[in-house]
Each structure stands twice: as structure tokens, then as C-alpha cells.
Interface confidence: low
């Protein structure tokens, strides 16, 4: 039963995110005669693609088409009919496709070409499939949640509905996390950004920012995970490896080929004298932690400060939100709390990775065995990335705020691409009659 | 190894409901698209419908749709199809399966249930 | 609703070639990809995936079974015929939720 158009001005905006491990799609709404007032736009529907992302169809370009339908036909649902032809459709591909471009740009292409023409058959208004930088992806995720938090507003009207009370006009830096990259996105204070590539200067809504933003591939969660088991296969001493990141009793054949399939264990690659290893968890926070910390070369740094990998990073400053798989692994741990201390964190995540398997499986029956067997790691990787690698402290634990949605909204880059592409985001601050569309992001 | 339990054989009267339950291990339902199928004694396979456990979300084929109902509970990891106002012609074996994404292998299927409906 | 027609039944020689029909309406393509599978099934059993997407072989399915075809028409074959492959074989098309064949008996004489 399709619906009815609605009686007010309204109009929508869909928006996949085609990220390393899924894809998901949003549907954004908002009135039509306040397009250019800040937060105003919400979305009105998550629809998780069934199946991998986007980059593991190389081999089967063919079956992309039926893996998007059921998400966009749940869009030809939501969307009034009568606003079908004027919704624009954006799909911005993450870290797994920048994988695979690097491996192959033509592979990549052709992926992308099959995502077009299959996104082309529907009656929406197709804006184009194309791979988003990390800078793109660290800077769209800091406007994205900006933008709910209510920063870029003069007018403080809606300041006491706002989950993160701050009554201030001071925005939130920006912790992302997939599966492929991690962003971390930040106005610094009074700090020159030493290196080009990792600054951004905008003008919104009659405000400058200069923004520091950089994006480190495979340091997503899953990609750092083969990373840690490609550096620790090498000093195996045979086809066993005891891993202290999977809890006790876990055991699970990994394929040599699987483990060096993806350009971010390269660096590690040698020849083994086994086609198979076994992994045997041993539970062990302290060791897992210790593990993850050699993925993070911090003898090497050209400027005053770095994260890691020679990569500058200003000060921290200001409050944080930590989004996408940040925020799921520590939902899921029960940990987003702002009560819980890093002190308190660390605890928790020993306990739990010295929980034995079979006891983890039958506390979490109906959890995926493959998602649940990764949240030691992912715990311990998330604390070990917060602490050494962006230099989070104990103290400055407090100011991270574990976000999913804010008013209704999922935290993510997906937001602060459309209001970008659709220009609704203006460069000065509107009249009481928007500005003509001039000068935007 | 994933594996698809059904609940017992059922005898019913006709004009009652029957609940049949499947329960997953070895992988998480969400994962899936859960379908289920019916077979009369002698006859072909007949598809009754599917439900999304991530979004509790159902497709019911038009035959069915004003007497089935399929409901999921992602804590125990089973999904159940209840069928209401029976009449003799629903005896059959009742079989759920999964089907990961349209198109793709279907991968598992339940043992079947049979249902029996007798005055 | 997409309505699949089997031919009814048949009867094979061990060692020979054993081919099924299956007519849609309508077509089973989609976007270039052709959502047509087929199943065995044995008396008590639950039906068993042989090839999915038209022409794929299922995951511990003998070579011996292939199947062929695009939009309306497809075909399973079984080369060379067993005295085990006596069972239903019902086509499906997952392009448009789930709809399954009639079915075709196959005997082996």
C-alpha cells in the first residue's frame, strides 16, 4: 500500500553508506521552506542491507542488484509516491572500496558501475555512487553530529532537549570507527595545523572553522583484527596461534590466503610453511592489549605531536562523540555510560575477555558467533586506540561521549554528505528569507 | 555448524490455531530471511512467507495473508508461524528455512512439522 | 505473482541423461541476474538446494547436475543418471519473494 503525499511542504533524501563490512541506507526528511535553518533535517528510516559490503561482490558484480532491492524497495515505502521523482539518491562507498581500488582500480570501477546502473532503476532522483575520501568521511561525520547537537545554531531554542547539555556554541570533535578506517575530526585550539592534509577550513552559517581531520586506513576495527593476526602468525612458532584477544576455549581456522588477501597486511606477509592456522583464544586483556599496541609506530613522528604512524595531531580539545562501531562494541559491553571511568573500562574488558567461550556463548544465545567472538579484541582495540593512539587520558576519558543517535538521527558521515550535496548547509547565517544558494561546504 | 530444530508433530481440530516454532543455532536468526513452507501428504512445495527478524518485518504470500502469522524472538534465536482458522486442507508438513540474501544459496532447512487437522 | 510451470514427470534409464523443464511467467531476471533455483527432494526428507542463481551448483552437489536458461525458460539436467537421483525436483524463483514449480517426478527404470 503505497502512501499518500503528505499535506505539508515536505522532502526527503536517501543516502546509502556503503561501508567495508554492509551497506545501510537512510532516509532524511525535512520541511521544504526551511531548508537553510540548522537542524531541521531527521532521518526517518535505517534499512541494514542484508549481506557483505559492497567491495566482496568484485566476484559477482551480478548479484548487486537483487542485494540493494529490499532496502530501496522499504524507500519506495517511505517515500510518498508523489516524491519519488524529486529525492535524490547518494551512495558513498568507505574504506573497503578504498581497498579495493588500491588493489585494483578497475575492479573497483566495475563494482561501482553495476551499483550505479542497479541504483538508475528506481524512481528516485540518482545522484551518482562514488568512493568518499577519509578526509571527506571525517569531515562529513564532524558536521553530521554539529548539526544534531545544534552548534551551527545562533538560536539556543531546542539546547534543553539535546542529549550532551554543553550550552555552548563549542563544537564536538569527531570519533569514527568502522570496519576498514577510523577518523578522528576536531577544531583544535589555537593551534596551527602542521600538516595540509589533515586541515579543513569552512564557513558555516556566517562562522569559521578550521578543522583538523585525518582518516587512518586499515585501522578499522576488522582490518586492524587481520592486522594483529598477520604480525603475530610470523612469530608463531607452527600452524597454533594462541591469542590472547579471543576468549578462553575459542578456536577458528584462518586461511594464510584469507589473512593476506587485504592490502593492510602486507607489511606483515611472508611465506608460511602451513596453508591453515588455528587461533586458541587465552583471554588475556593485558597481552591482547599489548599485542595491538606494536600496530602503532610511535618512534617516527616530523612534528610537534603525532597519533601514531607519523601522523600529526594537535591537542585535544573539547568534548568528543564516538560513533559507528565505537559506539556498538561499547553498547554491547555496556559501557557508553558517561559514569564509567577508563579505570572502569579497563576492568570490565579484562573480566570479559577472561570469560570462557561456551560461557559468552550461552550468556549472548542469539548473537552471531562471529560478532561475538570479536569483542575482546574490539574492546581492547577501541581502549588501545583512544589511550596511545590519540592520546585520551584518564582524565580526558570524560569528555568522550558514546553516541548512536542523536534526536532520532544516526551519528554517522551519511547526514553531513546530503546536507553538503543537497546545499543545505549555507556558508552565512540566514535571513529570515534563506539566502540565495551561493556559497556552501 | 548452523542448524534449523522445529517444535513436534500437532493434531488440531478444525477452526483452531496451531504455533509452530524453529530454533536456530549456530547463527544468529538476524542474519537471515526466515521462510516458511508447507507441504500437503502427495503434493509440491507452497511458500507461505518470510519475516526480517532484524526489523520484525513480514511478507505473507496473498493465500495466506489473513491467517498466518510469523513472529520471531531474536533472545532465543527461533522464529514461529502460527495459523489460525484451520481446515482440513492444511495438513501438511510445515518447513521453515533460511535464505541469507535474495537470491543466494538458500542455506538451511528445518526437519518439518507435521500438522494434522481432524475433526 | 510469478507463476512457474514443471513438466510432470519421467522416467530414465540409469547412466542417461535425465532433463527437467520449467516455464515462468513472468520473467525471473533481474537487473541481469536470474533468480531461478532448483531443489530435490526424497520422500521424508526436506527439500535439498542443487543450483541457485539459474546455473550455479549448491555447495556439495554432485557435477552430475547442472541447470541452464534465462528470463522464462529453464532447464535442470542430470548427466549421468543414478538409481539415488529417483525424487520430486521443484524449480523456484527467488526474484519476487518465493514461489516454487508443480514439481516433476523422475523414476529411474
Known amino acids: 500500500t503505497q502512501n499518500k503525499a503528505l499535506p505539508e511542504n515536505v522532502k526527503y533524501g536517501i543516502v546509502l553508506d556503503a561501508g567495508s563490512s554492509h551497506t545501510s541506507l537512510y532516509i532524511y526528511k525535512w520541511p521544504a521552506e526551511k531548508e537553510n535553518d540548522t537542524g531541521v533535517v531527521h532521518q526517518v528510516e535505517e534499512c541494514r542491507v542484508k549481506g557483505p559490503g559492497i567491495s566482496k561482490f568484485v566476484q559477482k558484480v551480478n548479484e548487486i542488484g537483487i542485494y540493494l532491492t529490499d532496502c530501496m524497495e522499504r524507500a519506495r515505502e517511505v517515500i510518498p509516491r508523489s516524491q519519488h521523482q524529486e529525492t535524490p539518491v547518494y551512495l558513498g562507498a568507505t574504506a573497503g572500496m578504498r581497498l579495493l581500488r588500491m588493489e585494483s582500480e578497475e575492479l573497483a570501477d566495475r563494482v561501482l558501475d553495476v551499483v550505479e546502473r542497479s541504483l538508475s532503476n528506481y524512481p528516485f532522483d540518482f545522484q551518482g555512487a562514488r568512493i568518499i575520501t577519509g578526509q571527506e568521511e571525517g569531515a562529513y561525520g564532524w558536521i553530521t553530529i554539529n548539526y544534531l547537537l545544534g552548534k551551527f545554531s545562533q538560536k539556543t531554542r531546542w539546547f534543553s532537549i539535546v542529549p550532551y547539555e554543553t550550552n555552548n556554541q563549542e563544537t564536538f570533535g569527531a570519533l569514527d570507527l568502522g570496519g576498514a578506517s577510523t577518523q578522528v575530526t576536531f577544531v583544535p585550539q589555537n593551534q596551527t595545523i602542521e600538516s595540509p592534509d589533515n586541515a579543513l577550513q569552512f564557513r558555516l552559517y556566517g562562522k569559521d572553522y578550521n578543522v583538523y581531520t585525518h582518516s587512518f586506513l586499515c585501522y578499522g576495527k576488522d582490518q586492524a583484527l587481520w592486522q594483529k593476526l598477520a604480525k603475530d602468525i610470523q612469530v608463531a612458532s607452527n600452524e597454533i596461534l594462541r591469542d590472547p584477544c579471543f576468549h578462553p576455549g575459542y578456536k577458528k581456522v584462518v586461511n594464510v590466503s584469507d589473512l593476506y588477501k587485504t592490502p593492510c597486511t602486507k607489511r606483515f606477509e611472508m611465506t608460511l610453511p602451513f596453508q591453515q592456522f588455528e587461533i586458541q583464544g587465552i583471554g588475556n586483556y593485558q597481552q591482547c592489549h599489548q599485542s595491538i599496541l606494536e600496530l602503532f609506530n610511535t618512534s617516527y613522528c616530523p612534528y610537534s605531536q603525532c597519533a601514531f604512524n607519523g601522523i600529526f595531531l594537535p591537542p585535544l580539545q573539547g568534548d568528543f562523540g564516538a560513533f559507528s562501531a565505537f559506539y556498538f562494541v561499547m553498547k554491547f559491553l555496556n559501557l557508553t555510560s558517561e559514569k564509567v571511568s577508563q579505570e572502569k573500562v579497563t576492568e570490565m574488558m579484562k573480566k570479559f575477555c577472561a570469560q570462557p567461550w561456551e560461557e559468552i556463548k550461552t550468556s549472548y544465545a542469539g548473537v552471531k558467533e562471529k560478532y561475538l567472538s570479536e569483542y575482546c579484541f574490539s574492546g581492547t582495540y577501541i581502549l588501545s586506540l583512544l589511550l596511545q593512539g590519540y592520546h585520551f587520558t584518564a582524565d580526558s576519558w570524560e569528555h568522550i561521549h558514546f553516541i548512536g543517535k542523536i534526536q532520532g538521527s544516526d551519528a554517522g558521515w551519511t547526514l553531513g554528505y546530503m546536507l553538503n550535496l543537497t546545499n543545505m548547509i549555507p556558508a552565512e547565517q540566514p535571513l529570515s528569507t534563506p539566502l540565495s544558494h551561493s556559497t556552501y561546504v | 555448524q548452523v542448524q534449523l530444530v522445529q517444535s513436534g508433530a500437532e493434531v488440531k481440530k478444525p477452526g483452531a490455531s496451531v504455533k509452530v516454532s524453529c530454533k536456530v543455532s549456530g547463527d544468529s536468526i538476524t542474519a537471515y530471511f526466515m521462510h516458511w513452507v508447507r507441504q500437503a501428504p502427495g503434493k509440491g512445495l507452497e511458500w507461505m512467507g518470510r519475516?526480517?527478524?532484524?526489523?520484525?518485518?513480514?511478507k505473507y504470500a496473498e493465500k495466506f495473508k489473513n491467517r498466518v502469522t510469523m513472529t520471531s524472538d531474536t533472545s532465543t534465536n527461533t522464529v514461529y508461524m502460527e495459523l489460525s482458522s484451520l481446515r482440513s486442507e492444511d495438513t501438511a508438513v510445515y518447513y521453515c528455512?533460511?535464505?541469507?540474501?535474495?537470491?543466494?544459496?538458500?542455506?538451511?532447512w528445518g526437519q518439518g512439522t507435521m500438522v494434522t487437522v481432524s475433526s | 505473482d510469478i507463476v512457474l510451470t514443471q513438466s510432470p514427470a519421467l522416467a530414465v534409464s540409469p547412466g542417461q541423461r535425465a532433463t527437467i523443464t520449467c516455464r515462468t511467467n513472468p520473467t525471473v531476471d533481474h537487473y541481469g541476474t536470474t533468480y531461478m533455483n532448483w531443489y530435490q527432494q526424497k520422500p521424508g526428507q526436506p527439500p535439498k538446494l542443487l543450483i541457485y542463481l539459474a546455473s550455479s551448483l549448491a555447495s556439495g552437489v554432485p557435477a552430475r547436475f547442472s541447470g541452464s536458461g534465462s528470463g522464462t525458460d529453464f532447464t535442470l539436467t542430470i548427466n549421468p543418471v543414478e538409481a539415488n537421483d529417483t525424487a520430486n525436483y521443484y524449480c523456484q524463483q527467488s526474484r519476487n519473494l518465493w514461489t516454487f514449480g508443480g514439481g516433476t517426478k523422475v523414476e529411474i527404470k
Open positions: 519475516i526480517d527478524p532484524d526489523h520484525e518485518r513480514t
Open positions: 528455512a533460511t535464505e541469507r540474501v535474495p537470491g543466494f544459496e538458500t542455506d538451511y
